[in-house]
Amino acid sequence: FERTRSLQDPCSNCPAGTFCDNNRNQICSPCPPNSFSSAGGQRTCDICRQCKGVFRTRKECSSTSNAECDCTPGFHCLGAGCSMCEQDCKQGQELTKKGCKDCCFGTFNDQKRGICRPWTNCSLDGKSVLVNGTKERDVVCGPSPADLSPGASSVTPPAPAREPGHSPQ
């Protein structure tokens, strides 16, 4: 069947980087500048992606593959194939509509992207808080109070003020 199809359809012989030109008796024509075809047998070439504004070119377009973009410094990629560039924030912050905001009490972000996450709930594993959390760092959990030797003590985190509803550590 494949062989029959290729005999009947001359376009199937057109390799990647070309298109089957109906205006020229279905001969294989090279893709025009700023276009590409990544597979054979195509009747048109696709327009190359242009990396403008906050996007910058990571890989140039060729006749057989699309351009690839990443983001200028201070921004990071989001979505499949870097479809969006999102502003970086500092550690201890997250991006909101108004820009970068400090993490709410009880949350942290140790990266320049993404959202603030809650501090680990040490008590879930029967442990206690060894080092308090900050905006930039998660709490450090230590042995459970029962495991501590006499005279040793663990740090108790401050009561969660301001933000309602953070679960107790």
């Epitope: 009880g106 996450r117 680990t120």
Partner: antibody, heavy 121, light 111 residues
């Protein structure tokens, strides 16, 4: 394909507890908040709280502090919400929902199908 | 407490345009994104507008969102109304990035 599949309907007596599950698939369970929202019959949406399954960190709405408990089992990618000391006013459809990790004030992009909890003596 | 207030119900004829408002009682409507969900009877909410004015894939361009800082409110506008648009619509924003807030919902009836 991202999916949140919740457990079936429950009928409970006042004073008892209910545990609703929300099984996630199609994404990295530990990297997104799971929110719990309820809707009483004929009423609007009400936030109960949320959990970060990556470390079990939780937040609760003031109205539900001490009565709601969220847990997450990362081995099965399942989040749980337990509500204790049930009363008739807790009769509602309970939803789990996922929030994207793009920004701190983002929308809920996927919702479970809802679990009807009826509290009746 | 931060509250989002929506009209309880709105109604309009097919083909017409309807606007549903969502007013913030305190703070600045521009501080956090506003999102809109559609909920048909017996179904879960689905996103119609996110981040103030963006439409998810598959949502018709008859749906649009906007923010009006002078009235401290957000709006969902549906043009070319169809009978299938009949549903409850909820706005959603934040009190803090931990605490989401929902409007009370608006029942849209297509006459």
């Amino acid at each position: 394909e991202v999916q949140l599949v919740q457990s079936g309907a429950e009928v409970k007596k006042p004073g008892s507890s209910v545990k609703v599950s929300c099984k996630a698939s199609g994404y990295t369970f530990t990297s997104y908040y799971i929110y719990w929202v309820r809707q009483a019959p004929g009423q609007g949406l009400e936030w109960i709280g949320n959990i970060w399954p990556g470390n079990g960190g939780t937040f609760y709405g003031e109205k539900f502090m001490g009565r709601a408990t969220f847990t997450a089992d990362t081995s099965t990618s399942t989040a749980y919400m337990e509500l204790s000391s049930l009363r008739s006013e807790d009769t509602a459809v309970y939803y789990c929902a996922r929030r994207p990790d793009y920004s701190g004030d983002d929308y809920f992009d996927y919702w479970g199908q809802g679990t009807l909890v009826t509290v009746s003596s | 407490n931060v509250m989002l207030t929506q009209p309880h119900s709105v109604s309009e004829s097919p083909g017409k345009t309807v606007t549903i408002s969502c007013k913030l009682n305190s703070g600045n409507i521009g501080s956090y994104y506003v999102h809109w969900y559609q909920q048909r009877p017996g179904s879960s909410p689905t996103t119609m507008i996110y981040r103030d004015d963006k439409r998810p894939d598959g949502v018709p361009d008859r749906f649009s969102g906007s923010i009006d800082s002078s009235s401290n409110s957000a709006s969902l506008t549906i043009s070319g109304l169809k009978t299938e648009d009949e549903a409850d619509y909820y706005c959603h924003s934040y009190d803090s990035t931990i605490t989401p807030v929902f409007g009370g919902g608006t029942k849209l009836t297509v006459l």
